[in-house]
Interface confidence: low
């Protein structure tokens, strides 16, 4: 009986040592990556950015708020939580893509239209789990039905057609604060990734019943952080098999 107890303790100790070793190597890997990043950025130490600064810099949209809060919870958590060996699991990553300007999106009066998105090489069509376009709709003064439409720009066809539809939806808005509206664009994004030359951008319209456009495409005064953006979730399948 005493023997078996001893044996159990030895096994436990061995397991704990393995855990500790694995955790240490993981921590040192992370530290090494941090040092590489800092040297690439020509920084001696990591910038001290508070959550409030991050909130100001990033779009004021629900998925980002959730990410910031999630990060905050993780940071507050002590390290005695369960450790997951990420070598052996598929992980999902959320990539936020902000619009950039494009030659294709010029209006007759020379003002650019929104939006053109350039994609990180991380976003591969077969790895896209979810893709949502987020747009902010300005507040309304009276109850109204809002007609939201997302158009995909295409090379002009023989009949002069310059775009095709991605999504159209109607929603009722009441006076008060503006709202963030998300639109599923996974299929469109996957097509763009398969055929990058087809990505000429999109046009966003959100008209109330009097034809006023409520979509914030180019934020005006007091509209910082209200740009449209893409929230893309990609999966990263593990490359290494369990040893």
């Amino acid at each position: 009986n005493e023997n078996s107890e001893q044996k159990e303790n030895v096994e436990k100790e061995g397991l704990c040592n393995a855990c500790t070793w694995r955790q240490n190597t993981k921590s040192s890997r992370i530290e090494a990556i941090k040092i590489q990043i800092l040297s690439k950025l020509r920084l001696e130490t990591a910038p001290n950015i508070s959550k409030d600064v991050i909130r100001q810099l990033l779009p004021k949209a629900p998925p980002l708020r959730e990410l910031i809060d999630q990060y905050d919870v993780q940071r507050d958590d002590s390290s005695d939580g369960s450790l997951e060996d990420d070598d052996y699991h598929a992980t999902t990553e959320t990539i936020i893509t902000m619009p950039t300007e494009s030659d294709f999106l010029m209006q007759v009066d020379g003002k650019p239209k929104c939006c053109f998105f350039k994609f990180s090489s991380k976003i591969q069509y077969n790895k896209v789990v979810k893709a949502q376009l987020w747009i902010y709709l300005r507040p309304v003064e009276t109850p109204t039905t809002v007609f939201v439409q997302i158009l995909r720009l295409i090379k002009p066809m023989k009949d002069g057609t310059r775009y095709t539809g991605i999504r159209s939806l109607k929603l009722d808005m009441n006076p008060g604060t503006g709202i963030w509206q998300s639109i599923d664009v996974k299929t469109v994004l996957q097509n763009w990734l398969k055929q990058p030359e087809s990505n000429l951008g999109i046009e966003i319209k959100a008209l109330d019943e009097n034809g006023h456009d409520l979509a914030v495409t180019f934020p005006g005064p007091g509209e910082d952080g209200l740009n449209p953006f893409l929230e893309v979730k990609v999966t990263d399948t593990p490359k290494r098999s369990r040893r």
């Epitope: 439409q149 109607k170 319209k205």
Partner: antibody
Framework: EVQLVESGGGLVQPGGSLRLSCTAS????????MDWVRQAPGKGLEWVSY????????YYADSVKGRFTISRDNAKNTLYLQMNSLRAEDTAVYYC????????????????????WGQGTLVTVSS | DIQMTQSPSSLSASVGDRVTITCQAS??????LNWYQQKPGKAPKLLIY???NLQRGVPSRFSGSGSGTDFTFTISSLQPEDIATYYC?????????FGGGTKVEIK
């Protein structure tokens, strides 16, 4: 408040012509497509014609194609239906109706419901 | 053309009853279906658009559901002012077509 007022109905002989008008107020008329819908006495509703906000796109029911013409004058906030070669079966109350969504939006094949109707004008085709 | 078959053509129910009307499209119309109410001698009024969206200002006792080819319109608790003829209408393609109507009366 949205208001649509039809006029121009009346009694006409078979083969004759009539022009219906619909004066709109309470909304940005030129931003909205419009429809004409009719209802024969004691019968159901029948869609007649559609016109886009700018007036460049029109659709017609097969029963009126080639005989009726829909048009609009956005400066006068007025919708028209020119009816030629009238038949007895065209006898109905004709309603003009505002389409629910501004026409700057393209709705990719699906048409939209009408959210406001006029009170209607009666057209009687009889000898 | 897309045919819209509405049933029943008429019904009689008591105040407070739940009333259900169905509409069937001859081909798939996704959710491009609208419901109108027409009271005697009056113009029709839009109640439900896109199969299930309640038009602003319409009482919540009216509701709609369905997609594809089969649709349902419900009055959860019939009121005396609901005496009217109700029409379904598809707006998926031209020509726009209406159902034959359902006349609702109070017992």
């Amino acid at each position: 408040e949205v208001q649509l007022v039809e006029s121009g109905g009346g009694l006409v002989q078979p083969g004759g012509s009539l022009r219906l008008s619909c004066t709109a107020s309470g909304f940005t008329f030129g931003s909205y497509p419009m429809d004409w819908v009719r209802q024969a006495p004691g019968k159901g509703l029948e869609w007649v014609s559609y016109i886009s906000g700018r007036g460049d796109v029109t659709y017609y029911a097969d029963s009126v194609k080639g005989r009726f013409t829909i048009s609009r004058d956005n400066a006068k906030n007025t919708l028209y239906l020119q009816m030629n070669s009238l038949r007895a079966e065209d006898t109905a109350v004709y309603y003009c109706a505002k389409v629910q969504s501004p026409s700057e939006l393209l709705w990719f094949g699906e048409l939209l419901p009408v959210d406001y109707w006029g009170q209607g004008t009666l057209v009687t085709v009889s000898s | 053309d897309i045919q819209m078959t509405q049933s029943p053509s008429s019904l009689s129910a008591s105040v407070g009853d739940r009333v259900t009307i169905t509409c069937q499209a001859s081909q798939v119309i996704k959710t491009w279906l609208n419901w109108y109410q027409q009271k005697p001698g009056k113009a029709p009024k839009l109640l439900i658009y896109d199969a299930s969206n309640l038009q602003r200002g319409v009482p919540s006792r009216f509701s709609g559901s369905g997609s594809g080819t089969d649709f349902t319109f419900t009055i959860s608790s019939l009121q005396p002012e609901d005496i009217a003829t109700y029409y379904c209408q598809q707006s998926a393609s031209t020509p726009i077509t209406f159902g034959g109507g359902t006349k609702v009366e109070i017992k």
